[in-house]
Interface confidence: medium
């Protein structure tokens, strides 16, 4: 096991504070421009797979959702907020690398249920759905604690 | 137990004026966005206009111009200002605000526009 791994659950604090400050620079942009609130895109039943038996695998793919699909499309629409998103997206990629070399820690198969609906109504709601996912960022990352919170405590 | 507590509201005559209040119990909504949502009778629930901490505003095109929505974080509180209004204006009004994670919303204001 690499010693990465060992000090993972002591670097998570940090980890998460990074990704909220870092949403923070960007945070009013998003929420300003996301008024659909009658639809949430990131529900608890998605909070619920995280918790679930197979979490790692619903973790990695919404990680994957963000790095490849919402932050490229976010960042065509403000140039002014690049720079964070691209940060953001970094510290994103960072942890889905230390998810897979801690691959013991986290048990990864099975397709996501929530996701593919998370997917469809993103994809439904066209540049609205960019704002929502962007402006949903700090949801993302308070079920990422959750998980990795649980995940921590077994 | 996060609550918003509205008021205002009530019976005005077309071209008429209205504010709207919003206090949350917490201060938690003094580093997030607030704002307003209507609904008609029979009608969904639709966007009014939105504040971001750093004032940064959004509104709906039917009240662009008519309605002003502003906030005094010291208070938590946000308000909206109606002018000019239309009979189309009446519904009941909704703040709402976002918490960490998550929406909340207030109990709801009647405003009825008579001509």
């Known amino acids: 096991l690499e010693p990465t791994c060992l000090h993972f659950s002591e670097l998570l604090p940090a980890r998460l504070r990074e990704l909220r400050v870092k949403f923070e620079e960007i945070k009013d942009y998003f929420q300003s421009r996301d008024d659909e609130l009658n639809i949430q895109l990131l529900s608890s039943e998605l909070l619920d797979e995280f918790k679930g038996t197979f979490g790692c695998q619903s973790v990695s793919e919404m990680l994957r959702f963000y790095t490849d699909e919402v932050l490229p499309r976010a960042m065509q629409t403000s140039t002014s907020h690049q720079q964070s998103m691209g940060d953001l997206g970094n510290m994103l990629l960072g942890l889905k690398a230390t998810m897979r070399r801690c691959h013991r820690f986290f048990t990864c198969e099975k397709r996501s249920k929530a996701i593919k609906q998370i997917k469809e109504t993103f994809e439904k709601m066209d540049e609205n759905g960019i704002y929502k996912a962007m402006g949903e960022f700090d949801i993302f990352i308070n079920y990422i604690e959750e998980y990795l919170l649980m995940r921590r405590r077994k | 137990q996060v609550q918003l507590q509205q008021s205002g509201g009530g019976l005005v005559q077309t071209g008429g004026s209205l504010r709207l209040s919003c206090a949350a119990s917490?201060?938690?909504?003094?580093?997030?966005?607030m704002g307003w949502y209507r609904q008609a009778p029979a009608k969904q629930r639709e966007f009014v206009a939105s504040?971001?901490?750093?004032?940064?505003?959004n509104y709906a095109d039917s009240v662009k111009g008519r309605f002003t929505i502003s906030r005094d974080n010291a208070k938590s509180t946000v308000y909206l200002q109606m002018d000019s209004l239309k009979a189309e204006d009446t519904a009941v009004y909704y703040c709402?605000?976002?918490?960490?994670?998550?929406?909340?919303w207030g109990q709801g204001t009647q405003v009825t526009v008579s001509s």
């Open positions: 917490t201060n938690i909504f003094s580093r997030n966005t």
């Open positions: 504040i971001t901490r750093s004032d940064i505003t």
């Open positions: 709402y605000a976002r918490g960490r994670p998550g929406i909340y």
